[in-house]
């Protein structure tokens, strides 16, 4: 009688992350009597991924029945299987022997491997704000993927970027690979409602890409512009003066009237109008008493935005022209904040 | 659902002979080595041996050889332990197991006069 | 017969508390065939770790088991109440099979 071979009719196995793989193995003979075992790899540090006869493998079950009588079907089933779980897998019949049971004959082995897909791209970008012309790096990551290849490309608002760095990680071979990009951003006033994008192609994905975002409106710090201008007379005493804060984001701002130097009130912005372009405007105003004032007033527009140093705009105010009137001591009224502000 | 039924206990005279038994369910004993284990009271686990229900081949630790007999019975899906000459030493709960996994709730053996 | 060693013996640990257990083999044992079990009084023991260092269905995950060769060890890495047990290891990688004399792990 022919001396038994194992047979493994298949050179390699592809399998998706999650999925069962099929190894499958027969025997030509039904002697020597002894177990089929299974290992992943060769020689004295391969690992037994299953016994016929004994040990806990919960993740595998064998295709067919092993005690039915002239079964020569050794072919086995692994469920779930990671990036992990890739490699060559051997059958091997053992003979019955004492005291322990010696391998007789290998299969060829199969290949078996795994396809991953890659996690969602996580975007991030830089821990401060900063403002227009200013480049700023964004980074993408992606982990738990195979094979190796993959493509990324950055995209700004719908345009792709091109000035970007990109690593796979490892270099060698692995169970799975993780991607690394850098991307260059150059600020512009009009970047608070732009996206930049991080887009990761892979096999495992059928054409339909996975996309990470990051809103520049993060990012972005657009500094506001100021103008202070005086309205006409209000009263024949009362001028009305206004500081038009234009174009910034974010909202966060702080704005100061100084009358000569000294603090006439302080107010932080509320109720902002918005711009197309997602920036606000906010507008505040004061009503100068000039019956109190001998002398010239200087008024500054002082304005904190986002936490940066205080940006300022002056206006002289001339006292001359308008007629003094007695009894009055407040430089500037208070007035609510209602009245103060315009929309 | 994987099941072994062990016998119920035994109470024995020193130098008789007790045959244990262990019937699986849910399982056809042919599939996997049957193993049986000893335990002393507040003591370790020792292997006694297995068989293989299939052909009736059977390993045994060097300490038992000539003290326990595994059997096997696959009409009845059921394994069993023989032990012989029994002495006090011999007191202690005897369990069944297949593939590390699976263990029956123990048979408590009292040798004594 | 290759000899499992355990040791502590016996070991009592707080709450909260890391625990290795480790299992000492006289001559080396495949990871693929080093099992842990957990016994408490008046039960059968339970497959806690097999392959070295894989959870059986069940065993909370403040478990791991690692190892190779002649060293293995088992670890719990913030001792709850209900980890006080006997803890043995096995190997069946070589005939006779043979278990590890346990440890007795209690909680203070």
């Known amino acids: 009688e022919e001396e038994l071979q194992v047979i493994q009719p298949d050179k390699s196995v592809l399998v998706a992350a999650g999925e069962t793989a099929t190894l499958r193995c027969t025997a030509t003979s039904l002697i020597p009597v002894g177990p089929i075992q299974w290992f992943r790899g060769a020689g004295p540090g391969r690992e037994l991924i299953y016994n016929q006869k004994e040990g806990h493998f919960p993740r595998v079950t064998t295709v067919s029945d092993l005690t039915k009588r002239n079964n020569m079907d050794f072919s086995i089933r692994i469920g779930n299987i990671t990036p992990a779980d890739a490699g060559t897998y051997y059958c091997v019949k053992f003979r019955k022997g004492s005291p322990d049971d010696v391998e007789f004959k290998s299969g060829a082995g199969t290949e078996l491997s795994v396809r991953a897909k890659p996690s969602a791209p996580v975007v991030s970008g830089p821990a401060a704000r900063a403002t227009p012309q200013h480049t700023v790096s964004f980074t993408c990551e992606s982990h738990g993927f195979s094979p190796r290849d993959i493509t990324l490309k950055w995209f700004k608002n719908g345009n792709e970027l091109s000035d970007f760095q990109t690593n796979v990680d490892p270099v060698g071979e692995s169970v799975s690979y993780s991607i690394h990009s850098t991307a260059k951003v150059v600020l512009t006033r009009e970047d608070v409602h732009s996206q930049v994008i991080c887009e990761v192609a892979h096999v495992t994905l059928q054409g339909d890409p996975l996309r990470g975002t990051a809103n520049l409106s993060e990012t972005i710090r657009v500094p506001p512009t100021l103008e202070v201008t005086q309205q006409p007379v209000r009263a024949e005493n009362q001028v009305n003066v206004t500081c038009q804060v234009r174009k910034f984001y974010p909202q966060r701002l702080q704005l100061t009237w100084l009358e000569n130097g000294n603090v006439s009130r302080t107010e932080t912005a509320s109720t902002v109008t918005e711009n197309k372009d997602g920036t606000y405007n906010w507008m505040s105003w004061l009503l100068v008493n000039v019956s109190a004032h001998r002398d010239d007033v200087k008024l500054t527009c002082q304005v904190e935005h986002d936490g940066q140093p205080a940006v300022s705009k002056s206006h002289d105010l001339k006292v001359s022209a308008h007629p003094k009137e007695q009894g009055s001591n407040t430089a500037a009224e208070n007035t609510g904040s209602n009245e103060r502000n315009i929309y | 659902e994987v099941q072994l039924q062990q016998s119920g206990a035994e109470l024995v005279k020193p130098g008789a002979s007790v045959k244990l038994s262990c019937t699986a369910s849910?399982?056809?004993?042919?599939?996997?080595?049957m193993h049986w284990v000893k335990q002393r009271t507040e003591q370790g686990l020792e292997w006694i041996g297995r068989i293989d229900p299939e052909d009736g081949e059977t390993k045994y630790a060097p300490k038992f050889q000539g003290k326990a007999t595994i059997t096997a019975d696959t009409s009845s899906n059921t394994a069993y332990l023989q032990l012989t000459s029994l002495t006090s030493e011999d007191t202690a709960v005897y369990y069944c197991?297949?593939?590390?996994?699976?263990w029956g709730q123990g048979t408590t053996l009292t040798v004594s006069s | 017969q290759i000899v499992l060693t355990q040791s502590p013996a016996i070991m009592s640990a707080s709450p909260g508390e890391k625990v290795t257990l480790t299992c000492s083999a006289s001559?080396?044992?495949?990871?693929?065939?080093l099992y842990w079990y957990q016994q408490k009084p008046g039960s059968s023991p339970k497959l806690w770790i097999y392959?070295?260092?894989n959870l059986a269905s069940g065993v909370p995950a403040r478990f791991s088991g690692s190892g190779s060769g002649t060293s293995y060890s088992l670890t719990i890495s913030s001792m709850e109440a209900e980890d006080a047990a006997s803890y043995f290891c096995?190997?069946?990688?070589?005939?006779?099979?043979?278990f590890g004399g346990g440890t007795k792990l209690e909680i203070k």
């Open positions: 001559s080396s044992v495949s990871s693929s065939y």
């Open positions: 197991a297949r593939r590390g996994f699976y």
């Open positions: 392959s070295t260092s």
């Open positions: 096995y190997q069946w990688s070589t005939h006779p099979y043979t």
């Open positions: 849910g399982f056809n004993i042919k599939d996997s080595y």
